[in-house]
Amino acid sequence: LRLLDHRALVCSQPGLNCTVKNSTCLDDSWIHPRNLTPSSPKDLQIQLHFAHTQQGDLFPVAHIEWTLQTDASILYLEGAELSVLQLNTNERLCVKFQFLSMLQHHRKRWRFSFSHFVVDPGQEYEVTVHHLPKPIPDGDPNHQSKNFLVPDCEHARMKVTTPCMSSGSLWDPNITVETLEAHQLRVSFTLWNESTPYQVLLESFSDSENHSCFDVVKQIFAPRQEEFHQRANVTFTLSKFHWCCHHHVQVQPFFSSCLNDCLRHAVTVPCPVISNTTVPKPVADYIPLWEPRSGSSDYKDDDDKGSSHHHHHH
């Protein structure tokens, strides 16, 4: 978790002088409670926005917006603490809005926003806005929290962000799988424009149970420049057991920007459907999947049909 690196952070608006400060997430009012404290935020909203750094990199950010309740407690509002908690790592980052002037009665509702928390693809967060000073130990809570799920790198807008491009989001391997004679499977995919090695992993399962019955890994050496964007072929010899027929093929690249953590692409090949005449029918369509690196999400975005999701020919 970090803040976007550019621009002085601003929270001032007409009628209010305000400064944004780094926060330890432990406001002084926790330790030294005040007698009079403001009410909680109203209508907290979290949205996915995108912002450029000074270097021109594009990052997903959490756009946090909330309003004040229309009660007299605004006279005791000294600021706000914004906290973003990454649910899985328990990492927390806070900033503090410090009001340098008192809020005045306003013709319209006071509204605040902040868009500088950088978030990671596929990660889950809890965003909290605490009004300051925080309440006395038995006082009514004066904070509001919302959860926030960041789409992964297959989301159309996420795909072009710097963290996603660094993990290979623009590479479309267009994996095809062909069943050959003699218990063989040919996997074909398009190489990316980088001289980097690849791994092709095959794991087979029985049709009835989800237990693995066969697995093998093949290495593909780094292609030369003239081979960029060409098709690479790998042939696997399958398990001799006819029931070990549900195959999961995964292509893992090792791009220099993401090394072992690059986005993987995969297809699954279901067991063939046997007709009455016992002649195996061709499988109509393989079920394609996008396999993430270990720290990102397996979610698939609506806006992005077709990215590594193709009909695979036999």
Partner: antibody, heavy 116, light 107 residues
């Protein structure tokens, strides 16, 4: 291929405890949280809580607070859910699921029957 | 806690027809809604999250509309494998809560 494989069915007496396991494969356990959800026979789904294998942090539904403990063993890529002081209305299928908000992969479920 | 209400409890539809399932939240949950499909004897399966984003491998015939408190799951042309129970779930605030489910059965 992401898989969550749960332990087998259990029959318990009222007042006893049950510990259900959930073994993860096809991804790194510490990369995502594990949530637990239960479903009484013929009923809907009820969220029990989650654990982060990365940090050990937990969040439990208030209803189960003090009666449930969620743990993980990263060496075996396994998550555990222990429910104590069982009552007959705890009879349900208990599911583990990956992630903490929208649950993208689920275990096959473990039926826990509480009966005297 | 946020109460999720699904309607109807049972929906009878012929194969090939459109099915429309409703889910209402007791307060605004923005777009923090997921839909799951559950078949008898199986675990739930994530269909949609973020109110409109399909999960991996979910066909385009599944779509969601709505934000705030009113959500609708639409199955544009029901296939035989779509007959199941569907649950909505909010993940806006703790605790996570599920709707009571809508059973889609063959007419």
């Amino acid at each position: 291929q992401v898989q969550l494989v749960q332990s087998g069915a259990e029959v318990k007496k009222p007042g006893a405890s049950v510990k259900v396991s959930c073994k993860a494969s096809g991804y790194t356990l510490t990369s995502y949280g594990i949530s637990w959800v239960r479903q009484a026979p013929g009923q809907g789904l009820e969220w029990m809580g989650w654990i982060s294998a990365y940090s050990g942090n937990t969040k439990y539904a208030q209803k189960f607070q003090g009666r449930v403990t969620m743990t993980t063993d990263t060496s075996t890529s396994t998550a555990y859910m222990e429910l104590r002081s069982l009552r007959s209305d705890d009879t349900a299928v208990y599911y583990c699921a990956r992630r903490q908000l929208a649950l993208d992969y689920w275990g096959q479920g473990t039926l826990v029957t509480v009966s005297s | 806690e946020i109460v999720m209400t699904q309607s109807p409890a049972t929906l009878s539809v012929s194969p090939g027809e459109r099915a429309t399932l409703s889910c209402r939240a007791s307060q605004s949950i923005s777009s923090n809604l997921a839909w799951y499909q559950q078949k008898p004897g199986q675990a739930p399966r994530l269909l949609i999250y973020g109110a409109s984003t399909r999960a991996t491998g979910i066909p385009a015939r599944f779509s969601d509309n709505g934000s705030g408190t009113e959500f609708t799951l639409t199955i544009s042309s029901l296939q035989s494998e779509d007959f199941a129970v569907y649950f909505c779930q909010q993940y806006d605030t703790w605790p996570l809560t599920f709707g009571g489910g809508t059973k889609v059965e063959i007419k």
